[in-house]
């Protein structure tokens, strides 16, 4: 039962994270939550950084600055892969949840 519950939590978290991405950066509250998660967990996107390509409000050559290894204003514009966290947040935060929840 515990594994089923954990998988359900992960699935919900994945869906919720992707929903929040769709609202980025239009919704300031959403943006700050996502930015905090990406910066704190050193991750980018849901599955990986390429998820940001699919967000209509984001230019295809851009990720949020919170994806950058060294966060500075505008660092996510025309990003280089070596300058950003490439791993996805769902797996990274999911791993943390599995250990701590």
């Amino acid at each position: 039962a515990g594994y089923v519950f954990r998988d359900k939590v992960m699935s919900e978290f994945n869906n919720n994270f992707r929903q929040q991405m769709e609202n980025y950066p239009k919704n300031n509250h959403t943006a700050s939550i996502l930015d905090r998660m990406q910066a704190d967990f050193k991750c980018c996107g849901a599955a990986n950084y390429t998820d940001w390509e699919k967000i209509p409000s984001m230019s295809k050559n851009r990720v949020p600055d919170s994806c950058c290894i060294n966060v500075t204003v505008g660092c996510g514009i025309n990003f280089n892969e070596k300058a950003i966290h490439k791993e996805g947040c769902v797996e990274k935060i999911g791993g943390w949840l599995r250990k701590n929840v």
Epitope: E53, S59, K60, C75, I77, N78, N80, E81, K82, A83
Partner: antibody
Framework: QVQLVESGGGLVKPGGSLRLSCAAS????????MNWIRQAPGKGLEWVSY????????YQADSVKGRFTISRDNAKNSLYLQMNSLRADDTAVYYC????????????WGQGTLVTVSS | DIQMTQSPSSLSASVGDRVTITCRAS??????LNWYQQKPGKAPRLLIY???SLQSGVPSRFSGGGSGTDFTLTISSLQPEDFATYYC??????????FGQGTRLEIK
């Protein structure tokens, strides 16, 4: 020193195919996005395609979409452009170009290879 | 897509002259603007990046300015080797990466 050497250009008939190669040396290839940029005779510069460090991200100009495919082999420090269904307006010098990204500009260009599409 | 418009498209000047070329973007590109020089039969060469930063090895007579939508490339005192074609290019929003149409600088 940084070197980008293109090869594979030549004369091809309309509808034909060609594969351009670019051999990179003198720098860490995986640190850079790479581009193909072309210049038709007597005309300006036109971006054709780019590929990210790992090859996970690839984009083409609308004018070549569905016909040209960019790829890279990081083990061989090589960049490629597969060109299919070639048309007369694809005639140009094709440059292999290094891209540090951010706001740094295209800092190194190859000497170019001429592709001529004519019957 | 962001359009880049250069002016003038051609320009005649003499050695020693001060020359300014302008580039306008169809929307704000902050400072994500680069300038290139190209001589006949040669590959382009990066002169200025980030609107105003001089690329390593480029003479200090070249300078760039502007931000947002309006940019300039200035050559303070033209030298014989500066007669060439100059292009601006934006990297703020892509694809596509877009260039200006070029400015041909000729000897008067």
């Amino acid at each position: 020193q940084v070197q980008l050497v293109e090869s594979g250009g030549g004369l091809v008939k309309p509808g034909g195919s060609l594969r351009l190669s670019c051999a990179a040396s003198g720098f860490t290839f995986t640190d850079y996005f790479m581009n193909w940029i072309r210049q038709a005779p007597g005309k300006g510069l036109e971006w054709v395609s780019y590929i990210s460090n790992s090859g996970a991200i690839k984009y083409q100009a609308d004018s070549v979409k569905g016909r040209f495919t960019i790829s890279r082999d990081n083990a061989k420090n090589s960049l490629y452009l597969q060109m299919n269904s070639l048309r007369a307006d694809d005639t140009a010098v094709y440059y292999c170009v290094r891209d540090p990204r951010s706001y740094y500009g295209f800092d190194y260009w190859g000497q170019g290879t001429l592709v001529t599409v004519s019957s | 897509d962001i359009q880049m418009t250069q002016s003038p498209s051609s320009l005649s000047a003499s050695v020693g002259d001060r020359v300014t070329i302008t580039c306008r973007a169809s929307q704000s590109i902050r400072n994500f603007l680069n300038w290139y020089q190209q001589k006949p039969g040669k590959a382009p060469r990066l002169l200025i990046y980030a609107a105003s930063s001089l690329q390593s090895g480029v003479p200090s007579r070249f300078s760039g300015g502007g931000s947002g939508t309006d940019f300039t490339l200035t050559i303070s005192s033209l030298q014989p080797e500066d007669f060439a074609t100059y292009y601006c290019q934006q990297s703020y929003s892509n694809p596509p990466i877009t260039f200006g149409q070029g400015t041909r600088l000729e000897i008067k």
